[in-house]
């Protein structure tokens, strides 16, 4: 899916409303320095990509962040706010259906949410940067 | 262990520039992000920016955005904050302190005192 | 910017009490709340983060609680060495801000 024409201020919104404090909802406890940065994005429609793919993209060591609250309000603003998003998640939801696992939050998880804050983190500020 | 080590004091007429240094070592340089955060006196902690060593992305607080510049030099591990157009209400204790993706600081360097007078 | 205000500004007790230092946000931060210790002369040293995590190497007698927009640090049973200025940092927004500090000191 191509981010280009997504409204990036009404994803800015929701995300500072409400996905932000599920995401640190869900890393509370962690140290600081226990995750290197390891991912990045350069301006805002790679930066949701970069989102969606370690979002949604089930890994070996971390196949649940799909059905996380965060995962699933990041979905429900992509649909909202990038036109033609939903129709390209239709075959992707169906193929996550078949493989859902057990929900365990692993350390690989952490590792995973960790990089996604940082993602967010220049989502917004590469928007501000425009402004 | 982490250690930050940051250059001397300095004294600065206004108008004037000033360049802190903060050399890391005890880990990767380009794993975590590294900060700036003043302390005028009597004043609360104030965070200014940050610099991911991996890419040199910055990020700015907007009360210091067109004078505060962070830069790195990756072949000696050492962060700079350079801070242009100085006025007497600059003079501070700056900091360099170090975090993950998740910024609260536990490292800290020990701090570096610009006093800023005419 | 999320404000954080602490109370009291300063704060006078005797060796033995029990201290609690306030701050309030002016906004969700969820739990992502740090406190720091600071004497003079020195750099900030990490107590709490997560509102409620003691770092590595606080004694015991440190302890933080709270979510939303009010959280506490308390000290069980205040030692000589822990008389200093206390901060509360909130990394929930992304412009990390501070409150303007407790003075502890000896009453």
């Known amino acids: 899916y191509d981010f280009t024409n997504c409204d990036f201020q009404k994803i800015e919104a929701d995300y500072l409303r409400t996905i932000s404090k599920d995401l640190i909802t869900y890393m509370s406890g962690t140290k600081s320095t226990d995750f290197n940065n390891t991912v990045s994005c350069s301006n805002r429609p790679h930066c949701l990509t970069e989102i969606q793919s370690l979002t949604f993209n089930p890994t070996p060591r971390c196949a649940s962040l799909a059905k996380e609250m965060f995962a699933r309000k990041t979905k429900a603003t992509l649909a909202l706010w990038c036109p033609g998003y939903s129709e390209t998640q239709i075959n992707a939801t169906q193929a996550m259906k078949k493989r859902r696992k057990r929900k365990v939050t692993t350390n690989k998880c952490l590792e995973q949410v960790s990089q996604l804050l940082g993602l967010w983190r220049r989502f917004i500020r590469t928007l501000l940067k425009k402004q | 262990q982490v250690q930050l080590v940051q250059s001397g004091a300095e004294v600065k007429k206004p108008g004037a520039s000033v360049k802190v240094s903060c050399k890391a070592s005890?880990?990767?340089?380009?794993?975590?992000?590294m900060h700036w955060v003043r302390q005028a006196p009597g004043q609360r902690l104030e965070w200014m920016g940050e610099?991911?060593?991996?890419?040199?992305?910055?990020d700015y607080n907007q009360n210091f955005r067109g004078r505060v510049t962070i830069t790195v030099d990756m072949s000696a591990s050492t962060a700079y904050m350079e801070l242009s157009s100085l006025r007497s209400e600059d003079t501070a204790v700056y900091y360099c302190?170090?975090?993950?993706?998740?910024?609260?600081?536990?490292?800290w360097g020990q701090g570096t005192l610009v006093t800023v007078s005419s | 910017d999320i404000q954080m205000t602490q109370s009291p500004s300063f704060l006078s007790a005797s060796v033995g009490d029990r201290v609690t230092i306030t701050c309030k946000a002016s906004?969700?931060?969820?739990?992502?709340v740090a406190w720091y210790q600071q004497k003079p002369g020195k750099a900030p040293k990490l107590l709490i983060y997560w509102a409620s995590m003691r770092h590595t190497g606080v004694p015991s007698r440190f302890s933080g609680s709270g979510s939303g927009t009010e959280f506490t640090l308390t000290i069980s049973s205040l030692q000589p060495e822990d008389f200093a200025t206390y901060y509360c940092q909130q990394y929930s927004s992304f412009t990390f801000t501070f409150g303007q500090g407790t003075k502890l000191e000896i009453k």
């Open positions: 906004q969700d931060v969820v739990t992502a």
């Open positions: 005890g880990y990767t340089f380009t794993s975590y992000l």
């Open positions: 302190a170090l975090t993950g993706t998740i910024n609260y600081f536990d490292y």
């Open positions: 610099i991911d060593p991996s890419d040199s992305y910055t």
